[in-house]
């Protein structure tokens, strides 16, 4: 039941967005394309051996603002870029790893828990 003053106009449904996915393809993806109500992303991060790994895919609307904010994580070199302006927009995203800090040279790629 609608409360007094509550709009009866239907809320706009999000339009599905198609994104390229690589190393991050969900079970419903086809030909390395996934679908989302949120953002396309491309991310670069170091694996346990210090090798840069690029992944791309779909981020759902819920929580994606936080995930796309690219807040630095101690002892983890990682960068993420997000987009929504067109389908497969993440094909054109090329995030780069943040520069090594002095302490990172000492710690190496070991991730402290």
């Amino acid at each position: 039941k609608k409360e007094d003053g509550e709009s009866t106009a239907p809320t706009a449904r999000p339009k599905v967005l198609r994104c390229k996915c690589h190393h991050h393809c969900p079970e419903d993806s086809v030909n390395n394309i996934c679908s989302t109500d949120g953002y396309c992303f491309t991310m670069i991060e170091e694996d346990d051996s210090g090798t840069p790994v690029v992944t791309s895919g779909c981020l759902g609307l819920e929580g994606s603002d936080f995930q796309c904010r690219d807040t630095p994580i101690p002892h983890q070199r990682r960068s993420i870029e997000c987009c929504t302006e067109r389908n497969e927009c993440n094909k054109d995203l090329h995030p780069t790893l943040p520069p090594l800090k002095d302490r990172d040279f000492v710690d190496g790629p070991i991730h402290h828990k």
Epitope: K15, E27, V30, D37, G60
Partner: antibody, heavy 117, light 113 residues
Framework: QVQLQQPGAELVMPGASVKLSCKAS????????MHWVKQRPGQGLEWIGD????????NYNHKFKGKATLTVDKSSSTAYMQLSSLTSEDSAVYYC??????????WGQGTTLTVSS | DIVMTQSPSSLAMSVGQKVTMSCKSS????????????LAWYQQKPGQSPKLLVY???TRESGVPDRFIGSGSGTDFTLTISSVQAEDLADYFC?????????FGGGTKLEIK
């Protein structure tokens, strides 16, 4: 209100091509995907493909690749589907339908395509 | 391609009776990321275009009478008409929108006795 207007019928010769139209009104064309669906008598519904009018990005059912080409004219809010090398198998009702997600919340009235000499 | 199978292919019911029709998919339509089933139901009255009744397996489209109830999860889905009316004479189709190409069931024809 949302309307998808399609011509009622088209009669085309075998081997020819046809361009079916779907004029959208009552909503912002670029906020929804536009789909095309084929229905032959007694053979249910078949999804042909879809187009995002905002960037003309298309997806096709592999069964219709090479047969159907989807385009859109934003200035007239009209979506088009061109069907080539027509045979009697292409005789059917063709619907346009819009979606936000990939369920179809508004449908055109359909164009009956007859391929005959 | 995901195969959608509907049963029965036709049924005849009297006004006021409860109707149930089944739709089965060849693979699960439940998306793990949001726990939604990517299945829709449509009604097509004679000489008309299809009309959306239910999406995400159980969400009734705005303006659809509440006698139409969608249920099920994974691979098994049901459309129930709690008390059939004369105007419900139509073909009913299910559609999966989990993975491209989107596919429809063969339909259930509802006749009124």
């Amino acid at each position: 209100q949302v309307q998808l207007q399609q011509p009622g019928a088209e009669l085309v010769m075998p081997g020819a091509s046809v361009k079916l139209s779907c004029k959208a009104s009552g909503y912002t064309l670029t906020n929804y995907w536009m789909h095309w669906v084929k229905q032959r008598p007694g053979q249910g519904l078949e999804w042909i493909g879809d187009i995002d009018p905002s960037d003309t990005y298309t997806n096709y059912n592999h069964k219709f690749k090479g047969k159907a080409t989807l385009t859109v004219d934003k200035s007239s809010s009209t979506a088009y589907m061109q069907l080539s090398s027509l045979t009697s198998e292409d005789s059917a009702v063709y619907y346009c339908a819009r979606s936000g997600w990939d369920y179809f919340d508004s449908w055109g009235q359909g164009t009956t395509l007859t391929v005959s000499s | 391609d995901i195969v959608m199978t509907q049963s029965p292919s036709s049924l005849a019911m009297s006004v006021g009776q409860k109707v149930t029709m089944s739709c089965k998919s060849s693979q699960s339509l439940l998306k793990s990321s949001n726990q939604k089933n990517y299945l829709a139901w449509y009604q097509q009255k004679p000489g008309q275009s299809p009309k959306l009744l239910v999406y995400f397996a159980s969400t009734r489209e705005s303006g659809v009478p509440d006698r139409f109830i969608g249920s099920g999860s994974g691979t098994d889905f049901t459309l129930t008409i709690s008390s059939v009316q004369a105007e419900d004479l139509a073909d009913y189709f299910c559609q999966q929108y989990y993975r491209i190409p989107w596919t429809f069931g063969g339909g259930t024809k509802l006749e009124i006795k």
